[in-house]
Structures are given as structure tokens and as C-alpha cells.
Interface confidence: medium
């Protein structure tokens, strides 16, 4: 009885730092990801970030975190599935296709880490109001951002 | 060194066609997504044509759409270019790029001229 007594507690503090420690560190490298990813996408403009896509963002008091972050890989979905082969967005020079390119690569990166956070299997997207894409992922990464200062301090 | 050689141009009638190879060599072929390029006279460099590593994702150009069908043999590394109905405005040297976040590497082009 002794021995397990005294173990006891300097187990419960490793188990406990242990789980601490694993869930920041899953925090820190999803949002790491996600925010290096909306750093990539909003320093560079290509022929469609001006594109309107749903603005989840304009009514959302009511919203979890997580149903935010499934709506919004929705929207990022709805935007690349739409606009992967839109030859008005690939361009006419090497440049242009290849910055495309790269928007939709970045685009799909972003909604499957969206996708991770949220947790969720589908979410509704119905607002009516539009913002450009640009502005949209101006938004999203503010939001990630807080939540990434929240989850590190 | 990187090679890219490309051959079956020449000069055509308008609605004619021609099939432009591109052999490559130095690289591993079936890695990389390839791309035409052209230049007409006194114009930039536009891309024409981009294909992905295996073959099954192809990109077109909003001018050649439904005329132009771009494939690869990656086991003779080889990229081709079918291109149909052809116009006098297609008149330009066709070259093939390797592409991996840019065309890196350029071939010494091909002169496809559509005249009557």
C-alpha cells in the first residue's frame, strides 16, 4: 500500500502533463498548418481571389467553433470544386496557370485541416451574404490566429 | 542533364492537323507534370496544354479547348500534343516544359505554321 500510494501521485502528475502536453501539441501543429497556409494564400493575389464565395463569417453568434470551422472548409470546397479547370482563373501565361495552380493546392490543404478541427461529417452552408475569397481568408485567418494566441498561451 | 526534344511540326492548312512530340531525357520522366507553351510572332509565351504525372489530370487553355488533346507515354517519355482544327492564329513555336511549380525546363521548340 505504501509503495502504490507514493507512486500515485507523481503518476497522476505525469499522466496529466502527458495529456496536456499532447493536446497543445495537436493545437499548435493543426493551427501551425492551417495559419501558414492562409499566410501563403493571402500574400499572393491571382486572376480569382476577387470571386465571391458565401460569407459564413457575417451571422455567425450563434455558431460553435467547430461548426464554424466545417462551414468554412464547405465554402473553400464549393470555391475549388467549382474553380479548379475555370480557365478564366488559370490564365493565359505559365505564371498565371501556375499561381492557379498553387491557390487550389493551398485551398485543399486548408479544407482538409478545416475538415480535422471541426470534427464534424457536414454542416449547412445557407447565408446569403458573398465576400470576395480574398476577404474570406483574410477573416479565417484572424480567426485563427485568436484561437491560436488562446491555445498556446 | 535535362532534355527536352521536340518534333512534328511544320507548315498546315487551316482546319488541318498535326501531332507534336516531345522525347525527354535526363529526368525521371513519369515524376513530373508536363506542359506545351507557344510563342506567336511578336507575343509572349502562353501555356497551351498542362498534364499531370500520370496522365489522368489535363488542363486546357480557354483558345484551344476541344481542339488541342494533350498526352503522355511514360514508358518512352514522351509528351504529345494532338492538335486539330487547326487556325492561323495557332501559328507559333510549341514548346514543352517541364513543370513542377514552374516550367523549369524548356525544350528548343517546335515551328507550327497554319497557312493557306
Known amino acids: 500500500m505504501g509503495l502504490t500510494s507514493q507512486l500515485l501521485p507523481p503518476l497522476f502528475f505525469l499522466l496529466a502533463c502527458a495529456g496536456n502536453f499532447v493536446h497543445g501539441h495537436k493545437c499548435d501543429i493543426t493551427l501551425q498548418e492551417i495559419i501558414k497556409t492562409l499566410n501563403s494564400l493571402t500574400e499572393q493575389k491571382t486572376l480569382c481571389t476577387e470571386l465571391t464565395v458565401t460569407d459564413i463569417f457575417a451571422a455567425s453568434k450563434n455558431t460553435t467553433e467547430k461548426e464554424t470551422f466545417c462551414r468554412a472548409a464547405t465554402v473553400l470546397r464549393q470555391f475549388y470544386s467549382h474553380h479548379e479547370k475555370d480557365t478564366r482563373c488559370l490564365g493565359a501565361t505559365a505564371q498565371q496557370f501556375h499561381r492557379h495552380k498553387q491557390l487550389i493546392r493551398f485551398l485543399k490543404r486548408l479544407d482538409r485541416n478545416l475538415w480535422g478541427l471541426a470534427g464534424l461529417n457536414s454542416c449547412p452552408v445557407k447565408e446569403a451574404n458573398q465576400s470576395t475569397l480574398e476577404n474570406f481568408l483574410e477573416r479565417l485567418k484572424t480567426i485563427m490566429r485568436e484561437k491560436y494566441s488562446k491555445c498556446s498561451s | 542533364e535535362v532534355q527536352l526534344l521536340e518534333s512534328g511540326g511544320g507548315l498546315v492548312q487551316p482546319g488541318g492537323s498535326l501531332r507534336l512530340s516531345c522525347a525527354a531525357s535526363?529526368?525521371?520522366?513519369?515524376?513530373?507534370?508536363m506542359a506545351w507553351v507557344r510563342q506567336a510572332p511578336g507575343k509572349g509565351l502562353e501555356w497551351v496544354s498542362w498534364?499531370?504525372?500520370?496522365?489522368?489530370?489535363?488542363y486546357y487553355a480557354d483558345f484551344v479547348k476541344g481542339r488541342f488533346t494533350i498526352s503522355r507515354d511514360n514508358s518512352k517519355n514522351t509528351l504529345y500534343l494532338q492538335m486539330n482544327s487547326l487556325r492561323a492564329e495557332d501559328t507559333a513555336v510549341y514548346y514543352c516544359?517541364?513543370?513542377?511549380?514552374?516550367?523549369?525546363?524548356w525544350g528548343q521548340g517546335t515551328l507550327v505554321t497554319v497557312s493557306s
Open positions: 516544359a517541364k513543370s513542377l511549380g514552374r516550367f523549369d525546363y
Open positions: 535526363g529526368f525521371t520522366f513519369r515524376n513530373y507534370g
Open positions: 498534364i499531370n504525372s500520370n496522365g489522368r489530370e489535363t
